[in-house]
């Protein structure tokens, strides 16, 4: 399955929008920094086949979408930027979904790497618990925004590697 060119453009747009969403200086939140232990090995395109990598990407974007779709998120960000960001993620989900469905239909496709899906889920669990622990403070959201920019960058790079594999 070939992801459309618009997909990588959407990915870049999402990153730009997330960058614009910052409301406070990251320097004022240095004491709130946290290592969420991004599962970098799950973004190593050489580690698994394309079908599996796309499932991991889908999980990553889906969890990001869910994280920014909460009431707490709505209260934290400027509404129009948040809506645009969510729209970009939603479009990416649709592209990835179509690819995963296509791969599911191919009988010889190896089973999804369930531990990779779980690693992504655990990563977002750490982020969720951090926000709860910090009572969804502006600095906590700023730290999370910066972290999600990192993870979206990893996603973008993985997609580039997948396209090169083609």
């Amino acid at each position: 399955c070939d992801l459309p060119q618009t997909h990588s453009l959407g990915n870049r747009r999402a990153l730009i929008l997330l960058g614009q969403m910052g409301r406070i200086s990251p320097f004022s939140c240095l004491k709130d920094r946290h290592d969420f232990r991004i599962p970098q090995e799950e973004f190593d395109g050489n580690q698994f086949q394309k079908a599996q990598a796309i499932s991991v990407l889908h999980e990553m974007i889906q969890q990001t979408f869910n994280l920014f779709s909460t009431e707490d998120s709505s209260a934290a960000w400027e509404q129009s930027l948040l809506e645009k960001f969510s729209t970009e993620l939603y479009q990416q989900l649709n592209d990835l979904e179509a690819c995963v469905i296509q791969e599911v239909g191919v009988e010889e496709t190896p089973l999804m790497n369930e531990d990779s899906i779980l690693a992504v889920r655990k990563y977002f669990q750490r982020i969720t618990l951090y926000l709860i622990e910090r009572k969804y403070s502006p600095c906590a959201w700023e730290v999370v925004r910066a972290e999600i920019m990192r993870s979206l960058s990893f996603s973008t790079n993985l997609q580039k590697r997948l396209r090169r594999k083609d």
Partner: antibody, heavy 119, light 108 residues
Framework: QVQLQQPGAELVKPGASVKLSCKAS????????MHWVKQRPGQGLEWIGE????????IYNENFKSKATLTVDKSSITAFMQLSSLTSEDSAVYFC????????????WGQGTLVTVSA | QIVLTQSPAIMSASPGEKVTLTCSAG???????LYWYQQKPGSSPKLWIY???NLASGVPARFSGSGSGTSYSLTISSMEAEDAASYFC?????????FGSGTKLEIK
């Protein structure tokens, strides 16, 4: 509010199959994995597996791979679990439960369907 | 798979008594992925405690959770009649996800 609706009971004959349903409402169905859990009378809970309604990918507990098949119908926002070659060991209450994170993990359960396997 | 062993299987407590239920894991479980559910007869389980020590919405403050590694517990500081139920621990630290066999807590 989030709701997962399951039929109350199913009576099936040994060797037959049954398809259980779990109709979701109150949230975007495709955004969360749906899980299935088995509970035999007076016993503990067993995780059967999960399905992502967005694309249909499944992850199973090895113990149930040859017993259960998970599917979804996005148009009717319903998750299904087919149980095959039923025996008395399959007589149990089967719950669907929605995934999530933090305080949303298995925060929403269906009422459960009691499956009775009897001749 | 990670086997969760709960003890005792059944226990009864008087109103006002302190109660501790334990959950022992066959191998180490990260505390972020250890949950507790309450279930009353004829009902589906209810999320009670998430990530070892966080109370779910609506759970009375007399409940608390603690633990790490292979040893976890749920404590009720002062037993009340409405606390009579079965309690299950659950882990999603690794596949397949597992539940404990449960502790049935009765009121004396």
């Amino acid at each position: 509010q989030v709701q997962l609706q399951q039929p109350g009971a199913e009576l099936v004959k040994p060797g037959a199959s049954v398809k259980l349903s779990c109709k979701a409402s109150g949230y975007t169905f495709t955004n969360y994995w749906m899980h299935w859990v088995k509970q035999r009378p007076g016993q503990g809970l067993e995780w059967i597996g999960e399905i992502n309604p967005s694309h249909g990918r499944t992850i199973y507990n090895e113990n149930f791979k040859s017993k259960a098949t998970l599917t979804v119908d996005k148009s009717s926002i319903t998750a299904f679990m087919q149980l095959s070659s039923l025996t008395s060991e399959d007589s149990a209450v089967y719950f669907c439960a929605r995934g999530g994170l933090g305080p949303a993990w298995f925060a929403y359960w269906g009422q459960g369907t009691l499956v009775t396997v009897s001749a | 798979q990670i086997v969760l062993t709960q003890s005792p299987a059944i226990m009864s407590a008087s109103p006002g008594e302190k109660v501790t239920l334990t959950c022992s894991a066959g191998s180490s479980v990260d505390s972020s992925y250890l949950y507790w559910y309450q279930q009353k007869p004829g009902s589906s389980p209810k999320l009670w405690i998430y990530s070892t020590s966080n109370l779910a919405s609506g759970v009375p403050a007399r409940f608390s959770g603690s633990g790490s590694g292979t040893s976890y517990s749920l404590t009720i500081s002062s037993m009340e009649a409405e606390d009579a139920a079965s309690y299950f621990c659950h882990q999603w630290s690794s596949y397949p996800f597992t539940f404990g066999s449960g502790t049935k807590l009765e009121i004396k």
